[in-house]
């Protein structure tokens, strides 16, 4: 790391170490040998998140509701607004600009993980033992039907799509 | 009281490595910078550099970059300056001192030493 | 860098004498200058600091002057605990930089 001129929370400005302005305020004026750097809060609209030297700050960020958003976290002088999507949506990139549909998993498919307002729907394949029959966005793969608990026999096998279908045993008079 | 007690004098061979640790008390160790300075025999005095023992932050001299590392241990409230590959022009008494408190200063860097410690000699011969 | 010249590089006066020493910086540093006090053996002493700010503890017999690039020291009566050699530190900037000190030796 290069040498710097002045100590942490400083900047170099006509030969002269100056303090930053605090998270939350802007720079209005460098300092001199007499003064203090000079710093005013950021409006009820704008923020700056780091120690800085900017004369303008950040607008917050605007949770557009046509794209699907809405405010997760209101913002404050010292941090942006956090959007998030509406119910069944999800943020299509990490800085959720705008919001898609959940996926749903197809027959075949249970949910694995349910989506989030940031991640979408995870699915995973139905193991041996497990079906699922709907497209949905919540359902887990579910076991097949034991047709022995219930006094009954399998007369037609399972497969990840359909339950197992159960009917009465054979039962041979002697 | 503020006292900075330093590690014993070294000897060491060239292109060796040498570790001074500079032990605080009496204040609050993450408060203050500390600063490394060298006085070689019969010279004048060498800034080398300082820690910020709160954040880790370090800034050192051109001359020493690459060679030198300052660290601390806040649990026990030391500092320790290391320079590798040493040399015969490195023979000096190194000093730990201490800075202005955080925040004392606004503009400047105003870094003024008002507790320093006793010196560590450090001999590099072969 | 900046550089810290300090004149003269030694003196010889006598206990009672005014004592004066500049400090001369390669440019401006405003009035981030510290003087320290060395005596032989040991780590040095600060004196005084943003050029006229005098130390807690340190004699009143101790003065410093000067702005910009231009800095003096002065003992305006030297006493024997004060021979020594004195050191300016500019504070304006990193790195830090020391002049090459003044020698008060007895006349």
């Known amino acids: 790391e290069p040498p710097t001129a002045c100590r942490e929370k400083q900047y170099l400005i006509n030969s002269q170490c100056c303090s930053l302005c605090q998270p939350g305020q802007k720079l209005v004026s460098d300092c001199t040998e007499f003064t203090e750097t000079e710093c005013l809060p950021c409006s009820e609209s704008e923020f700056l998140d780091t120690w800085n030297r900017e004369t303008r700050c950040h607008q917050h960020k605007y949770c557009d509701p046509n794209l699907g958003l809405r405010v997760q976290q209101k913002g404050t002088s010292e941090t942006d607004t956090i959007c998030t999507c509406e119910e069944g949506l999800h943020c299509m990139s990490e800085s959720c600009e705008s919001c898609v549909p959940h996926r749903s998993c197809l027959p075949g498919f249970g949910v694995k993980q349910i989506a989030t307002g940031v991640s979408d729907t995870i699915c995973e394949p139905c193991p041996v033992g497990f079906f699922s029959n709907v497209s949905s966005a919540f359902e887990k793969c579910r076991p097949w039907t034991s047709c022995e608990t219930k006094d009954l026999v399998v007369q037609q096998a399972g497969t990840n799509k359909t339950d197992v279908v159960c009917g009465p045993q054979d039962r041979q008079r002697a | 009281q503020v006292q900075l007690v330093q590690s014993g004098a070294e000897v060491k061979k060239p292109g060796a490595s040498v570790k001074v640790s500079c032990k605080a008390s009496?204040?609050?160790?993450?408060?203050?910078?500390m600063h490394w300075v060298r006085q070689a025999p019969g010279q004048g005095l060498e800034w080398m550099g300082w820690?910020?023992?709160?954040?880790?932050?370090?800034n050192y001299a051109q001359k020493f970059q690459g060679r030198v590392t300052m660290t601390r241990d806040t649990s026990i409230s030391t500092a320790y300056m290391e320079l590798n590959r040493l040399r015969s022009d490195d023979t000096a008494v190194y000093y730990c001192?201490?800075?202005?408190?955080?925040?004392?200063?606004?503009?400047?860097?105003?870094?003024?030493?008002?507790?320093w410690g006793q010196g560590t000699l450090v001999t590099v011969s072969s | 860098d900046i550089q810290m010249t300090q004149s003269p590089s030694s003196v010889s006066a006598s206990v009672g004498d005014r004592v004066t020493i500049t400090c001369r910086a390669s440019?401006?540093?405003?009035?981030?200058l510290a003087w320290y006090q060395q005596k032989p053996g040991k780590a040095p002493n600060l004196l005084i600091y943003?050029?006229?700010t005098l130390q807690s503890g340190v004699p009143s017999r101790f003065s410093g002057s000067g702005s910009g690039t231009d800095f003096t020291l002065t003992i305006s009566s030297l006493q024997p605990e004060d021979f020594a050699t004195y050191y300016c530190?500019?504070?304006?900037?990193?790195?830090?930089?020391f002049g090459g000190g003044t020698k008060v030796e007895i006349k």
């Open positions: 943003t050029a006229s």
């Open positions: 440019q401006g540093i405003y009035s981030w």
């Open positions: 820690i910020n023992p709160d954040s880790g932050g370090t």
């Open positions: 009496g204040y609050t160790f993450t408060g203050y910078y």
């Open positions: 001192a201490r800075d202005q408190p955080l925040g004392y200063c606004t503009n400047g860097v105003c870094s003024y030493f008002d507790y």
């Open positions: 530190q500019q504070a304006n900037i990193f790195p830090l930089t």
